[in-house]
């Protein structure tokens, strides 16, 4: 018969032959042959594979480093990775929770809407027109642009969400 060019789900093509993939939690030891099935072995104690696979090495479970403020939220199995979370009062820096911060800062162009607490992180908001923030801060709100008019000056450079307006003297020359 004609050798296959594609295989069924949970199979892979090798040496013109369809072999079974290893199930989650197991790694590939040897490909199948005309006469033998795919050989798989369970992952070790601190390892996992979470898909049907042909991997020859299992992945190491994530380490929740206490020096980064991390602790184990859910212990890994042979089929799942360990899930880390932060110590109480700390907040993950990303969805993957690779490190923790006491709170996040709002970038330039954003102001603090709500200062962090033990349970909630800093809430930032974009500076609206007429306001700016030129710093990274965990407590500063957006500042209003300087009013040149009240200083008897004129706007020489428009403000942005990250910069204040630049005021200058009025042009005394009249046509």
């Amino acid at each position: 018969p004609e050798p296959p060019t594609a295989c069924r789900e949970k199979q892979y093509l090798i040496n013109s032959q369809c072999c079974s993939l290893c199930q989650p939690g197991q790694k590939l030891v040897s490909d199948c042959t005309e006469f033998t099935e795919t050989e798989c072995l369970p992952c070790g104690e601190s390892e996992f594979l979470d898909t049907w696979n042909r991997e020859t090495h299992c992945h190491q479970h994530k380490y929740c480093d206490p020096n980064l403020g991390l602790r184990v939220q859910q212990k890994g199995t042979s089929e799942t990775d360990t899930i880390c979370t932060c110590e109480e009062g700390w907040h993950c820096t990303s969805e993957a929770c690779e490190s923790c911060v006491l709170h996040r800062s709002c970038s330039p162009g954003f102001g603090v809407k709500q200062i962090a607490t033990g349970v909630s992180d800093t809430i930032c908001e974009p500076c609206p027109v007429g306001f700016f923030s030129n710093v990274s801060s965990a407590f500063e709100k957006c500042h209003p642009w300087t009013s040149c008019e009240t200083k008897d000056l004129v706007v020489q450079q428009a403000g942005t969400n990250k910069t204040d307006v630049v005021c200058g003297p009025q042009d005394r020359l009249r046509a």
Epitope: G69, V135, E140
Partner: nanobody, 116 residues
Amino acid sequence: EVQLLESGGGLVQPGGSLRLSCAASGFTFAGYEMWWFRQAPGKGLERVSAISGSGGSTYYADSVKGRFTISRDNSKNTLYLQMNSLRAEDTAVYYCAKDPYSFDNWGQGTLVTVSS
């Protein structure tokens, strides 16, 4: 390597005063907002006060407003917290921290005990 070293803690009677210092090294001090946190025995971390890099903007928790004053001397790379009218509930380990507020960007703390 960022280093933050707090000092100035101690035992003080209610109504007394203390001045905490935080000596900073390993980064451009003037370019960073700084915070004071505290942790009372068996409690979570509490945000006490913050100051902008220039020193022009400050923040105080309601519990310390009017009693504590945060300041900084950028020429000495040092952050301060002047604590007046101390109360028993101010007893805690006080920490300084810099942005980003990660585990390696805060100090070891100094213990303040307010007791008669």
